[in-house]
Structures are given as structure tokens and as C-alpha cells.
Amino acid sequence: TPLGPKWPEPVFGRLASPGFPGEYANDQERRWTLTAPPGYRLRLYFTHFDLELSHLCEYDFVKLSSGAKVLATLCGQESTDTERAPGKDTFYSLGSSLDITFRSDYSNEKPFTGFEAFYAAEDIDECQVAPGEAPTCDHHCHNHLGGFYCSCRAGYVLHRNKRTCSALCSGQVFTQRSGELSSPEYPRPYPKLSSCTYSISLEEGFSVILDFVESFDVETHPETLCPYDFLKIQTDREEHGPFCGKTLPHRIETKSNTVTITFVTDESGDHTGWKIHYTSTAQPCPYPMAPPNGHVSPVQAKYILKDSFSIFCETGYELLQGHLPLKSFTAVCQKDGSWDRPMPACSIVDCGPPDDLPSGRVEYITGPGVTTYKAVIQYSCEETFYTMKVNDGKYVCEADGFWTSSKGEKSLPVCEPVCGLSARTTGGRIYGGQKAKPGDFPWQVLILGGTTAAGALLYDNWVLTAAHAVYEQKHDASALDIRMGTLKRLSPHYTQAWSEAVFIHEGYTHDAGFDNDIALIKLNNKVVINSNITPICLPRKEAESFMRTDDIGTASGWGLTQRGFLARNLMYVDIPIVDHQKCTAAYEKPPYPRGSVTANMLCAGLESGGKDSCRGDSGGALVFLDSETERWFVGGIVSWGSMNCGEAGQYGVYTKVINYIPWIENIISDF
């Protein structure tokens, strides 16, 4: 029997019946064995076929077989119901070898020309499988010349058998208090040859509860307990299972905080697997009862390990742990069934005793000593000498624990001294210097410090004076001895004040005229206002209307009198304002330099002389009565004048205060 070509020779060629294309002889038997390389198969087709037709091809035939399997027995020229001729069919070996046998019997009724066939080796596509046959690979099949290989989807690994995909299903750890886990691909069939381990690991104190849900289908056996595929559940206390079959296992209350679930599958079967819903429980904590005036959040039916709640107080109430205020409160349930913190109280906000108001008092409106939420207090200032600035003095204890005014201010109101009060009434007559009576000039300040000078009290801690009077002490403010509340210059009965700082107008040049002759002294303490110590008012914008030419102002001081000595008793003089041009002209002639009188000055006195301020009065106030407010205000500051006080045709020159209101206000607000 002639043999066909053997691999690795090129595997292709032609086969023909003996004598082709002539007729074949009787009693012929010819056999060809074709072999292809591994991973290849043989393809064969006929270009000519003419054999004697017989029932079931018993007489003459061509038989194709591959291994033990007969692929076809062929005869005739065309196929019939019981016989087959190749026609245009192509035949394929099952493996890499193909046997072809030709046989003719002892006779032919007429001549037959036999057959001609061609063959070739071709790659087998192992990935193509016939319907109903098992796939070559579990997941992905990759064909190549001479062979194939399998690969797996993510989450799987190729088994040793090179075809099966085992699930990578170990090492998953569940730490949430509840969750779901299932067999790989659930509810689709689970993978073969897999070993899965799942862990549920909760904090100590929790107990895991397992519920099998939906469906359960794990390969089983009628006689043996779960020999193929099985599910096992292990805790530190006991083992549950193995489980298999189609019945949902019962709930498992593990009484453990750690559970290991093992699922093992073999190489066969087609089952959907399982799904577990797990929950956990723990020893519950006592139900939190909200304190009066508070509420619990969130509200739950029960609270177990790690559950928490917060307490929120109603408006006007605050969280207190005993005496300790809390910004917030959250308690957490512990594993022993107790809360980690004791329940706080929601106590009514207490603003506490209100601060004392300097020069004022406070009255409890709601009730004696009541300082809790919504309580009302009323501040008021000491009558006559103080007036309330900023608000009406009514404060309410608000939810933030602060006394708050109706305007929303949390700072105290201010009792500002009433200015410009005097016991003196003015008749408008001009007459000689007179002794002041108690309460006539309560703003009068005596300044001692090298020389005698004067000033006027502003508010309750500032003194307005002339720059030249305190220039020497500008760097040594504490050297100034400031006295008030007395009429007698030498009296031991006075209110002492001390200077904290001296502010001289930056436009003042010492010994170079008296322009900007103005200064402020800040006292180191506030003085108590009474009928003998009261501040002078600063001029309003409209004050110029009370300071026209011939309007009467009053100067007071302990300066030199006609007798040439400092006055023992406070003296005052009423003098008219002098026309500015007239005054300027009076000081244009020698010995006064031109421009001595500036727009920052005003003049007062009699043309005939005799009434004037003098040395020792420097810094004192020239005051006017504001007939609208009925308060006295400072219009001028005693500054300079002729060498001989009260000289005819000469006038007292005063710093014009209204020009310096912004300067005064800036310094007082800044310091």
C-alpha cells in the first residue's frame, strides 16, 4: 500500500485511481495515509469521480477515515438515498491524519474512469466547536497556526489544565455592618475548579447574622454529602455546612464578629450558586431619653455598638455637662452596651450678672437677679450729669449668652457726661471782673507745672488748653498737676487729675506766633462728674451764629488781676467779640509783626480796655451760651494779647475752637 507524504514534508498533493484518467481495473485495492503536522488537519476534495454504483457502495468504493472513524464511503457519480458520491464536498480529517482506501470488485458492467482528488494540510481552528459540544476554553479561545490557547476574564486565573478558568475569589474582607456576598457570576453559573474564601470581619462586640436569599443551587449527589461542590461557614466557635443542593439553608446567627465562608467547585456542572445577605447585631445601649428642652438625633428604634446620637437644645438653652458647657454633644454606643458619655442637660442660657456701667446703674426688669434667656435689664445713667450714648439702655439676655441691646450691640452703653451745665445765668450786661460762685464754671481746670495755666474739661477724661501753656511738658505729661472742682486756687480741697499724654497741634510753632495755639491733655483716669466738675461742650456747626461781633463770651481764670497778682478765687469777665478786621489792625503796628492775628483766632474785649484775660489765664475757655440747647460751649481758648492786659485799643486773642473740631475729634477717637 503506497504511503502518502509524511510531515515535515510539504503536505499537499494529488491522488488518483490506478490508470486515471483511463478506466480502472478490477480487483484493485489502493491505500493512502496522509499525515499533517500537529495542530493541522487535512482537507480533501475530488475533481473527478466515476465509480460503479452499488447498494451501500459494496462493489467499488473510496473510503475516507480519520483514526477509527469512517468519514465517508463513496461510489457512483451522484448521490442517491443510500449511496454517496463526493460531488463538490470537501472532506476534513478529524485529527492530523487521513486514510484513503480505493477498492474495486471482480467485475464492472461498463468501464468507469475512477477518481482524481487533491489534498492539503490546513490549520485546525480549535476554537470553533460544533453546536452542543463543550467549548474548547472556559472564557476566551485564541487560535493560531498549529494550535490554540485559552485565557480568562479579569478576576479569573487559568487552571493547570490550560482550559478552565478558576475564579480569583479569595481574600475579600467585608467590614461593613451589613452587606451581600455571592458565588462568582451569581445568578449565572459559577466557575469550575475554584476555591473561594470570603471573610466578614466586624469590630469586637458585633455578632454576624447570615441569611441565604433568592436562590441556592450547588452541585450535589443523591448519596454522598456534597462530594463535588460545597459551601462551608466557619466562625471562631463552630463550623456550619457543608451546604449543597437546591434548598436555601436556614438563617445562621453566628454569635461571632468574624466569619469565614469557603466555596469549592470541581471541573463539571452548571449551577447558579448562592447569595448571602449578612447583617450584624450587638448588645443595645439604653434608649437615650432627651433631656428637657432638648431633642435626640437621629431617632432610631434601637442603638447598638457604634451607633451614635447627638443632643440639640432648643433656642435659649445650652448643652451643659454639669457645670461644663459643651459646644456639641455626641454619644457612641460601646460594646458593653453602655454609652461612652453621660447625657448632658439643656440648661437655660444664663448671661450672668450684667457688667456695672460706669456712671450709671442697672435695673432688673424681669425679676430680681434674673439673668437667664430673654430676661430684660435696663441700664440708665446718673441723672443730670450723664446722658446715655448709643442706645436706649434696654438689654435682653440672648441665646448666645450675651446681654444684647435692641440694636444688637453686645457692648455696654456709654454714660457720657452732660456738657455745658452751669449754675450761672447771664443777663448780657458787661461789667468788671467778678468772683465766680460754685457751679458757675464747672469745666474750669487749673494746670500747674512750672507756670500757672488753665484748661477746660471735655467729656470726663480730656482737657482742652493752649499749646503754649503746656509746651514745656509735652514730653513729660506726668509733670502736670491738674486740679478741678475748686474755686480757690490754693485750696487743699480739689479733685486731683494726672495727665497720661499731651497732644500739641502739629501746626503750632513755639516762640513763633500763636497760630494753632491749641492742645489736648488726656487724663489717666475718668473724673466723676458733679455740679462742680462738668465738661464744656464743643461748638456745634451752627455755633458761629452765637459768636458774631459784639456777642458776649465769658472768660474765667486765676490769672493776674488789676493788682498784678494771681487771683486767689476764680474770676470771670464777660466780654464782647471784636470785629476781626478791627482786631487784625490793632495788632499790625509795632511791636507786633504783620500777620499776628490769623483766621484761626478770634478777639474779644472792650475798645476802652479794662476787661481782659491775662497771664495765668492761658488755656482757659472763652465760653458762649447756645440759646437753642441752653448749654455753654467753648468758642475760644485764652492765647495771647497785649503786654499790658486790658489795654485800651488792644484785645484779648483767643484760639478759634470751631476751626479745630476735626482735629479734636480725631485725637479723642484715636486715643
Epitope: H323, M343, A345, S347
Partner: antibody, heavy 118, light 112 residues
């Protein structure tokens, strides 16, 4: 005025329990915490814990957890301390105190002497 | 726990003379609201303790102004300007800032 009246002295056997009462008057009982303090003979003071009558919520010093239990009775404005598993170490004077916003020890009861002896 | 250390253990003072007791805590007693919950108590012989001073320096009503409390953080002092016979007893400092509240070891004031 605020008053805290405590129950009288008690002689108890080791291993048993004792319940001390503290009856409050002169203020709203539910508004302020009640503290309990232990003083052993000739020794210093030790805070046992407190209870807030407004919620009935107690808090215990770890040294007394599991042995001391605080309760309140609103009808009599009374606070109670139950001390269990007594030993000779528990022989002491026990005080109840009431706090205010400035601290827990503003007002003191007169004290209850507990003697643990076989 | 916060440890409260008092010195001296015993103080022997002549009537009319000043006295001073120190109390140190193992950590600051300043609470988050800016207040320091440090009290001074006096326990006269055979009596319950009585609070003299709260919030470091505030005197309870009825307490004579010869008692003054001072300090901050973890260092506190109780001073008596002129000791009187009724002042004898054991003085305790106690903190109410941290749980559990803790007492000082006590200082016994004796009259010389």
C-alpha cells in the same frame, strides 16, 4: 435655701449592698446635677460620679463603675446611691453634693457614715 | 486622671498672721470656654466640706474677704491675709475641668 439631707449611718456586712439617700430642697431638683463623694476615715476625698435628675443619666468614675449605681425619685426629690459587693475598703463617709454653673461642689450634704464589718 | 498636689501637708499659723497654700495640677485646668474650674474647700473638724472659692478666685457668699484665690493653668494658691481661730481645718483644692473630678491631698491648718 439649698439643702441636701442624707440618710443616717449604716452598719453592713461584707459582700452585701448599701443604699444611701440624699433628699434635696430649696431648688428645682431636676435642674442640677447631684454628685457623690467618698471620704475614708482620716483620708482625702474621692469623686464617685454624678447623676442628672433631669434625664436620669448617670456618669461613674471608672474606679466605681459596676459597683456604684445612681438613681432618682422625682416624687421625693431624692437621689440614691447603691453600693454593692462591699468590702472593708468601702467603710467611709459618703457625701452628696450639688453643683452650679461654677463647679460641682457648691452645696454639700451632712454625710452618711457606712461601716462594713463582719 | 488629673493629679492635684497640695503643699504643705500641715500649716501651723499664729492667729492674725497670713497663710498660703499651694495647689498644682498635672495638667492645665483651663476649659474651652476660657474658665478654670478650680475650687477651694474647707472641712472643719467633724463637718462636711464647704466651698470657699470657685473659678480660681471668686469668693462664695458669706466667705470673709481675708481669703483670696489666685493662679492659672496648673498652678494655684489660696491665701489667708490674717488667720482667725475659725479658719482651722483641712483645706482641699478640687478641679472640675476634667473627668473624673479630683481633689487635692489636703492641707491641715493648725493654730499655733
Amino acid at each position: 435655701q439649698v439643702q441636701l439631707q442624707q440618710s443616717g449611718p449604716d452598719l453592713v456586712k461584707p459582700g452585701t449592698s448599701v443604699k444611701i439617700s440624699c433628699t434635696a430642697s430649696g431648688y428645682t431638683f431636676t435642674d442640677y446635677y447631684i454628685n457623690w463623694v467618698k471620704q475614708r476615715p482620716g483620708q482625702g476625698l474621692e469623686w464617685i460620679g454624678w447623676i442628672f435628675p433631669g434625664s436620669g443619666s448617670p456618669y461613674y468614675n471608672e474606679n466605681f463603675k459596676g459597683r456604684a449605681m445612681f438613681t432618682v425619685d422625682y416624687s421625693s426629690s431624692s437621689a440614691y446611691m447603691l453600693l454593692s459587693s462591699l468590702t472593708s475598703e468601702d467603710s467611709a463617709v459618703y457625701f452628696c453634693t450639688r453643683g452650679d454653673r461654677s463647679g460641682p461642689f457648691a452645696y454639700w450634704g451632712q454625710g452618711t457614715l457606712v461601716t462594713v464589718s463582719a | 486622671d488629673v493629679v492635684m498636689t497640695q503643699t504643705p501637708l500641715t500649716l501651723s499659723v499664729t492667729i492674725g498672721q497670713p497663710a498660703s497654700i499651694s495647689c498644682k495640677s498635672s495638667q492645665s485646668l483651663l476649659y474651652s470656654n476660657g474658665k478654670t474650674y478650680l475650687n477651694w474647700l474647707l472641712q472643719r473638724p467633724g463637718q462636711s466640706p464647704k466651698r470657699l472659692i470657685y473659678l480660681v478666685s471668686k469668693l462664695d457668699s458669706g466667705v470673709p474677704d481675708r481669703f483670696t484665690g489666685s493662679g492659672s493653668g496648673a498652678d494655684f494658691t489660696l491665701k489667708i491675709s490674717r488667720v482667725e481661730a475659725e479658719d482651722l481645718g483641712v483645706y482641699y483644692c478640687v478641679q472640675g475641668t476634667h473627668f473624673p473630678f479630683t481633689f487635692g491631698t489636703g492641707t491641715k491648718l493648725e493654730i499655733k
